[in-house]
Interface confidence: low
């Protein structure tokens, strides 16, 4: 149409200027389009420089849109992580504060002389919750062993108790159960509760980390060309009012985000596992019940030791022989009053229920985040035409868009008409993140079954969100006792069911 040759470029000038580019680049009227590299080569209002500028801009706009969507998801996960983390830490801190407030009155010097041992137990529980690679059963065993040694000495100040006698005491302890059932109960419940709590919080951290890293994956040059064609070629070709056809937009973004869609299966698995493990937050072995009540097990243990003192002493003497009397030592300790026990079952505050129901709802909402991303970006960011519009922009002109919409993921882009995707070259960053999701899901599944797993940090570059510090100086791969004196056997017998560990660790 000869008239179209002299069509004004006023609308393009307006749009181009609004993007912050120089208006001197824009022709007054349409020119021949042989110079175009991305848009169809009809008459055009775009010079080569304009096409390049708009291609760069469309690429940046898509990356921004992608990052914005990711940021919303990251913020949600970070908020969840903070809320749960605060709650779990608060439970443990509350338990420790209760212990510090009540034990001096309840147990006198039996507590004050050993306050640091109790405090260190809480420190180790905190470290364990935060993902340190330490063995909780062993940590508890060492605590009980050490506590028994110290309390036995305190209860018998009139006796000389050399190292070899204390070793013998440690060996007897497994059979004697000096602290009653408390150590066994605490071990069973604490392992399940802490592993559930920390794996859930770590799951949130890994999910957030994956989103952050995937949002940084750059879009390739083929994607840039396709997005330019989708968003700005209509302007260049003099049909600025035409909106992209919905299926055309989906195909472009499915091609651009093919690798991201491959996260879908493992992302769903992770979120399912996280929802599932919240079942472990309830009941007598649940997180709230156990973490907030550590001090009550400790009180029960000391009471049991005091109640059993005479029997225990007799049996120890029977097994280890008569210890020498300390001529300088005072008489035997007076039998102490029992420490009053707070009720073991903490009444649920309702905080955790609220947190869990919110988390479940939000995690379900974002389950299909990766495969719905092309559709979401098209509908929210691309000003699409309606589905019934047969005069939408189809990449060549105004008209219907005929190709079928591609499936999700890299493999399904083999015949994508809009983006040339090399399906033999998956993005390595995204493959690594798929691996991280798998690892975390396996941890959650183990945790659901009550199994402790080696919680080294799941992130590949060490920048994860609080999911553990890997090797924490003296807590690294703790498979041996804290005792280091060459003349001593590690005391790991105070907890029924744990055999003596081999080897010794220097402090």
């Amino acid at each position: 149409d000869p008239a179209s040759k002299s069509r004004s470029c006023g609308e393009v000038r307006q749009i181009y200027g609004a993007k912050g580019f120089s208006l001197s680049d824009v022709p007054q009227a349409e020119i021949s389009g042989e110079h175009l590299r991305i848009c169809p080569q009809g008459y055009t209002c775009c010079t080569s420089e304009m096409e390049e500028n708009l291609a760069n801009r469309s690429h940046a706009e898509l990356e921004t849109a992608l990052r914005d969507s990711s940021r919303v998801l990251q913020a949600m996960l970070a908020t969840q992580l903070r809320s749960f983390d605060d709650h779990f830490q608060h439970l443990l801190n509350d338990s420790e504060r209760t212990l510090q407030a009540t034990f001096p009155g309840a147990f006198g010097e039996l507590y004050t002389q050993n306050a640091r041992a109790f405090r260190d137990l809480y420190s180790e529980l905190r470290l364990y919750y935060r993902g340190a690679n330490l063995h909780l059963e062993e940590t508890l065993a060492e605590f009980w062993a050490r506590l028994l040694e110290r309390l036995f000495k305190q209860l018998h100040p009139q006796l000389l108790l050399p190292d070899d006698y204390l070793d013998c005491l440690g060996k007897q302890a497994e059979a004697l159960r000096p602290f009653g059932e408390a150590p066994r109960e605490l071990r069973l419940r604490a392992t399940r509760a802490f592993v559930a709590a920390r794996s859930f919080v770590q799951g949130l951290g890994v999910a957030s980390d994956v989103v952050r890293k995937v949002a940084q994956v750059p879009l390739g040059p083929e994607c840039s060309r396709a997005v330019m064609k989708l968003v700005y070629c209509a302007h260049c070709l003099g049909v600025p009012g035409a909106r992209p056809c919905p299926d055309y937009c989906r195909n472009v973004l499915k091609g651009c985000l093919a690798n991201q869609a491959d996260l879908d299966a493992e992302w769903r698995n992770l979120l399912d596992s996280m929802v599932l493990i919240t079942d472990k937050f309830w009941g007598t072995s649940g997180v709230e019940s156990v973490i907030g009540s550590v001090h009550t097990w400790l009180a029960e243990a000391i009471n049991a030791l005091q109640d059993n003192r005479d029997t225990l002493t007799a049996k120890v003497i029977q097994g280890c022989g008569n210890p020498k009397v300390n001529p300088q030592g005072p008489g035997p300790e007076e039998k102490r009053r029992r420490g009053k026990l707070a009720p073991r079952e903490r009444p649920p505050s309702g905080t955790l229920e609220k947190l869990v129901s919110e988390a479940k709802a939000q995690l379900r909402d974002v389950q299909d985040f990766w495969i719905s991303l092309p559709g979401t970006l098209c509908s929210e960011k691309m000003a699409l035409s309606t589905a019934s519009d047969d005069r939408c922009w189809n990449g060549m002109a105004r008209g219907r868009y005929l190709p079928e919409v591609m499936g999700d993921g890299l493999a399904n882009q083999i015949n994508n008409p809009e983006v040339e995707v090399d399906i033999t070259k998956p993005d390595m960053t995204i493959r690594q993140q798929i691996m991280q999701l798998k690892i975390m899901t396996n941890r959650l599944r183990s945790a659901y079954n009550g199994n402790d797993v080696d919680f080294q940090d799941a992130s590949d570059d060490g920048s994860g969100s609080g999911s553990g510090d890997g090797c924490l100086d003296d807590l690294c791969s703790r498979k041996v006792s804290r005792k280091s004196s060459s003349s001593r056997t590690p005391l790991t017998h105070a907890l029924p069911g744990l055999s003596e560990q081999e080897g010794q660790k220097t402090s």
Epitope: Q89, N93, T112, Q113, R116, A117, R119, D120, S123, E124, R126, L127, R130, A132, R146, R150, K153, D163, D469, L472, D473, D474, L475, R482, S485, S507
Partner: antibody, heavy 118, light 106 residues
């Protein structure tokens, strides 16, 4: 490797305040108590107090309660001691020391010399 | 507070000689801790829980004692052992240190 890196020496005027830092690395900062110890020629080593980096809870030596304030910044894994109303008696080397589980200062900072002089 | 008194304040020993220094507490403590400090350096943990050797400490060092009386022994003095040695208690607040024993090489 566990490291405690303290800030550099300070020369301050009587009556002023000073804030010394102790940056921790190589371990989980919130997992262990941090202590501060004063060393002066006259008084040997004196324990100032301790802070639980996880909760911010502190315990002070009564003698230093009005003199020292212990704080932490979890985000940078740094512990701080602020000393106020300084006099010549506060001139000393101040150490941060990290507890290792079960009662011991296994790790020490390199010390920060504070000199109070007009 | 528990006061720890170290004696002697200053002592000297020849290489190969056995060295013993003591730390007396004003009231009974559960365990004693010993630190070594050389001029210009931070204290270094030697002995914890009265008799346990800290990591990397030579076996010529040993600790013993109970109640109010504790001691640190070097079985054979070496030149590198010349330093000031401090005892410390954790049994009650405030934590306290002894005034130190300065060990010189004869």
């Amino acid at each position: 490797e566990v490291q405690l890196q303290q800030s550099g020496p300070e020369l301050v005027k009587p009556g002023a305040s000073v804030k010394i830092s102790c940056k921790a690395s190589g371990y989980s900062f919130t997992g262990y108590y941090m202590h501060w110890v004063k060393q002066s020629p006259e008084k040997s080593l004196e324990w100032i107090g301790e802070i639980n980096p996880s909760t911010g809870d502190t315990t002070y030596n009564q003698k230093f309660k009005a003199k020292a304030t212990l704080t932490v910044d979890k985000s940078s894994s740094t512990a701080y001691i602020q000393l106020k109303s300084l006099t010549s008696e506060d001139s000393a080397v101040y150490y941060c020391a990290r507890e290792r589980n079960y009662d011991r200062f296994a790790y020490w900072g390199q010390g920060t010399l504070v000199t109070v002089s007009s | 507070q528990i006061v720890l008194s170290q004696s002697p304040a200053i002592m000297s020993a020849s290489p190969g000689e056995k060295v013993t220094m003591t730390c007396s507490a004003s009231s009974s403590v559960s365990y004693m801790y010993w630190y070594q400090q050389k001029p210009g350096s931070s204290p270094r943990l030697l002995i914890y829980d009265t008799s346990n050797l800290a990591s990397g400490v030579p076996v010529r060092f040993s600790g013993s004692g109970s109640g109010t009386s504790y001691s640190l022994t070097i079985s054979r003095m070496e030149a590198e052992d010349a330093a000031t040695y401090y005892c410390q208690q954790w049994s009650s607040y405030p934590l306290t240190f002894g005034a130190g024993t300065k060990l010189e090489l004869k």
